[in-house]
Interface confidence: medium
């Protein structure tokens, strides 16, 4: 692939893991023991985009799947989706903006802000087993902080 990626898993600040829920949706729930194998492994690609000291543009694909998290307008609302792409062309250095997230690191916690929709973040609900979504509020009830765990290639 044109851009080398980092394999990782993500957990929200309440330690909920992310798993597939149907073919095009992720949900967040607490996993233990062997169930941890269900969690999604992301392929994080470092792409070109606006960057500052603590804001790094990345794309989040699902490892060994031709699916990427993307941000689009649905019914006039910024929405998170899993989008299918041509694996021959992805990942690439210059990803379309809908695929790009600004990875923001604060005290070893990560936020993922949509590059397409500033101040909208990958979010999870406090409740168990709910979809991962794009949220427009930080510091409220919804969770926007994540930790990353390396996964060997």
């Amino acid at each position: 692939a044109p851009v080398r990626s980092l394999n990782c898993t993500l957990r929200d600040s309440q330690q909920k893991s992310l798993v597939m829920s149907g073919p095009y949706e992720l949900k967040a729930l607490h996993l233990q023991g062997q169930d941890m194998e269900q969690q999604v492994v992301f392929s994080m690609s470092f792409v070109q985009g606006e960057e500052s000291n603590d804001k790094i543009p990345v794309a989040l694909g699902l490892k060994e799947k031709n699916l990427y998290l993307s941000c689009v307008l649905k019914d006039d609302k910024p929405t998170l989706q899993l989008e299918s792409v041509d694996p021959k062309n992805y990942p690439k250095k210059k990803m379309e903006k809908r695929f790009v997230f600004n990875k923001i690191e604060i005290n070893n916690k990560l936020e993922f802000e949509s590059a397409q929709f500033p101040n909208w973040y990958i979010s999870t609900s406090q409740a168990e087993n709910m979809p991962v979504f794009l949220g427009g509020t930080k510091g409220g009830q919804d969770i926007t902080d994540f930790t990353m765990q390396f996964v060997s290639s």
């Epitope: 470092f46 990353m148 390396f150």
Partner: antibody, heavy 123, light 106 residues
């Protein structure tokens, strides 16, 4: 402002082990998105990457040196270290420690902070 | 093993444009960084991710990368730009440096 400082003996005997330490100041070695590397430069020659380490302790080494190089990290002292075994005169060089950004060098962010370098002579 | 090839030396007159090349197999598929090293000093990152400048690096430094060749361009070269320049890329968990190019400002 994050700074790096190499330290260690300037003279090592052939067949012995070269040991250097890099002390990180002005920032934490435990910041998860950084990696830490060692690079050397023989007199009058170019840069040669030796290896990287991550705060978690995982390492990548130059295949040509892999059997002789060990890099370790001590988060409590905010330091990382290099050991190069079975040295010969060909290992005489200036040794630099450096900080890389964004977990892996393939991210393209490069090594943005370097120490001033320390000269090690094998004789 | 992967190799990056640079010309050993490049000369330029003050105020002119200097171009330093770095070639490697399908290099355009990788990110390239460039470092400047003046005599007796540590390397300094001048370009990352092919074409981006760290803060504090003058605008006269620019980079490009496509096909098998990455290029560092210094426009309006100044005497202070005289230094060794190294390209750097990454291959299979390994950091690769080019052999370096000595830029002489005549």
């Amino acid at each position: 402002q994050l700074q790096l400082q190499e330290s260690g003996p300037g003279l090592v005997k052939p067949s012995e082990t070269l040991s250097l330490t890099c002390t990180v100041s002005g920032g934490s070695i435990s910041r998860s998105s950084y990696y830490w590397g060692w690079i050397r430069q023989p007199p009058g020659k170019g840069l040669e990457w030796m290896g990287n380490i991550y705060y978690s302790g995982s390492t990548h080494y130059n295949p040509s040196l892999k059997s002789r190089v060990t890099i370790s990290v001590d988060t409590s002292k905010n330091q990382f270290s290099l050991k190069l075994s079975s040295v010969t005169a060909a290992d005489t060089a200036v040794f630099y420690c450096a900080k890389g950004r964004e977990y892996i060098s393939s991210s393209g962010y490069g090594m943005d902070v370097w120490g001033q370098g320390t000269t090690v002579t094998v004789s | 093993s992967y190799e990056l090839t640079q010309p050993p030396s490049v000369s330029v007159s003050p105020g002119q444009t200097a171009s330093i090349t770095c070639s490697g197999d399908k290099l355009g598929n990788k990110y390239v960084c460039w470092y400047q090293q003046k005599p007796g000093q540590s390397p300094v990152l001048v370009i990352f991710q092919d074409s981006r400048r760290p803060s504090g690096i003058p605008e006269r430094f620019s980079g490009s990368n496509s096909g098998n060749t990455a290029t560092l361009t210094i426009s309006g070269t100044q005497a202070m730009d005289e230094a060794d320049y190294y390209c750097q890329a990454w291959d299979t968990s390994t950091v690769i440096f080019g052999g370096g190019t000595k830029l002489t400002v005549l």
